[in-house]
Amino acid sequence: TDCPELAVENASLNCSSSDRYHGAQCTVSCRTGYVLQIRRDDELIKSQTGPSVTVTCTEGKWNKQVACEPVDCSIPDHHQVYAASFSCPEGTTFGSQCSFQCRHPAQLKGNNSLLTCMEDGLWSFPEALCELMCLAPPPVPNADLQTARCRENKHKVGSFCKYKCKPGYHVPGSSRKSKKRAFKTQCTQDGSWQEGACVPVTCDPPPPKFHGLYQCTNGFQFNSECRIKCEDSDASQGLGSNVIHCRKDGTWNGSFHVCQEMQGQCSVPNELNSNLKLQCPDGYAIGSECATSCLDHNSESIILPMNVTVRDIPHWLNPTRVERVVCTAGLKWYPHPALIHCVKGCEPFMGDNYCDAINNRAFCNYDGGDCCTSTVKTKKVTPFPMSCDLQGDCACRDPQAQEHSRKDLRGYSHG
């Protein structure tokens, strides 16, 4: 029996004969911009842009069902036009057009905002683009804008605005010695400005021998006034002279003196925590310093909070190392020797691609990243020794590691 007439839209047919008898063959080629869809028994076999397919009449049926569907370019995205939103009322197939609008605060540059779906399934090259602009930068607290043009509302990506911190403020991260006050912010790709900030200049804390004896109006920040109340009323060294003022350059305008009534010496430090040793070559007078050290050579002297002992230091706690205590004018040791403990020091070879259990704590920078897959250089954690448990002492504990980015990090905030 003959096959029915072969009719394929958007295609050209080339048949072996005009008859549709058993064994007759036709080659189907889709027009440019259309894709061959080949089915057998209503099941899609393949979709191809390639040149043609041959169908054969077999027992009154064509052995394949063929259609030519328009190429689909799919909805355009930022790869076509950055910072734009697209509208495609005609769909996204061959020949159809989409228009785009620039998302605020980007602005259209050029006048043809249409894209056409091309025969190869790609969108036509845009003849316009969205130029991202930044609005006027927001005010930075305690800073003055130095660039006049930056008060306007249109700024190209990459352009800079210069600021200067007000007296008594400086750029964070710059040391008090360098006191950097000027900084620039840049208009970024997403139409926002890089953040800039000015933080108050601070003075160094007064010498530790005065610890606990002074009151300050605003900590050690610029303009703060710190005072020690003396009982003596000697005119040359009276009440007024034991006041110091933090200047805008980060230095004090003077220095404290020891009040006349502050005499004597600190008691001999005893009842030290285990392994701790104090050496006091200058005795125990006010201002005398005792060097702290640990009897075990590979331990370090550190300060722990009152209620924490060496045995129960959580891994996220990064205790402060301490190298000396000083006898204050209040005849107390600072820091108090009872708070000083000896903790096992870090082993060498942090960041060497071996996870050393002893270093897997904040105090040792989590072994330089060696215990987390996301931070170890080889991207594979190798415990050392091999018996170290990857769920136990050699587990990924670093709260900064990617492994913890979606977990509940309460309790890590101390570290």
């Epitope: 050579h297 190392r321 020091g345 060498p348 942090m350 330089g368 050392f384």
Partner: antibody
Framework: EVQLLESGGGLVQPGGSLRLSCAAS????????MSWVRQAPGKGLEWVSA????????YYADSVKGRFTISRDNSKNTLYLQMNSLRAEDTAVYYC???????????WGQGTLVTVSS | DIQMTQSPSSLSASVGDRVTITCRAS??????LNWYQQKPGKAPKLLIY???ILQSGVPSRFSGSGSGTDFTLTISSLQPEDFATYYC?????????FGGGTKVEIK
């Protein structure tokens, strides 16, 4: 008194070999990692190699990897550096250093000069 | 590898001056930074470890500060015996690397 004393330096031709030794005294040698640091004439310090306390984990700078071998004999309180395939750029004073805790070189030897020249 | 950049490479100062040397790491090294002093013909000597801790026996005129990538060694009042070359060294990860050195000379 804590002391490190290097020996074994000298003049050697390019391609030649040399073995440096470092004798330790005044501390428990087996309780510390040890290291070699070198300094070319008129130049800065360059870390060369290190070895852990007892299990013998070894580390090398890329510039010497495959040519130098660090080792230790805890029974003799001695650190070694076997240097093969020596090059002119290996000319330097070689210091032996004790590694304390999370890596600081707290005790240094006086250094031994290695000159590689034809 | 972590690169360490010291500045300045040399400086001239007088006795009594306050001297500041900076060291910058190519990536964050937390506080794993040490400072050494070296005099001509001598071995280096450890001054400061973990960025700010003074090694035992080192005068308190030496101080260190910083964390992350930027570090500072300060000599509050330069003494005649302080004229030397100073090196920073990172111990955050192997290979351990030194800065190029800063030579402090007499003005």
């Amino acid at each position: 008194e804590v002391q490190l004393l290097e020996s074994g330096g000298g003049l050697v031709q390019p391609g030649g070999s040399l073995r440096l030794s470092c004798a330790a005294s005044g501390f428990t040698f087996s309780s510390y990692a040890m290291s070699w640091v070198r300094q070319a004439p008129g130049k800065g310090l360059e870390w060369v190699s290190a070895i852990s306390m007892t299990v013998g984990r070894t580390y090398y700078a890329d510039s010497v990897k495959g040519r130098f071998t660090i080792s230790r004999d805890n029974s003799k309180n001695t650190l070694y550096l076997q240097m093969n395939s020596l090059r002119a750029e290996d000319t330097a004073v070689y210091y032996c250093a004790r590694v304390w805790g999370g890596v600081r070189f707290d005790v240094w030897g006086q250094g031994t000069l290695v000159t590689v020249s034809s | 590898d972590i690169q360490m950049t010291q500045s300045p490479s040399s400086l001239s100062a007088s006795v009594g001056d306050r001297v500041t040397i900076t060291c910058r790491a190519s990536q964050s090294i937390s506080t794993y930074l040490n400072w050494y002093q070296q005099k001509p013909g001598k071995a280096p000597k450890l001054l400061i470890y973990v960025a700010s801790i003074l090694q035992s026996g080192v005068p308190s005129r030496f101080s260190g500060s910083g964390s992350g990538t930027d570090f500072t060694l300060t000599i509050s009042s330069l003494q005649p015996e302080d004229f030397a070359t100073y090196y920073c060294q990172q111990s955050s990860s192997t290979p351990w690397t030194f800065g190029g050195g800063t030579k402090v000379e007499i003005k």
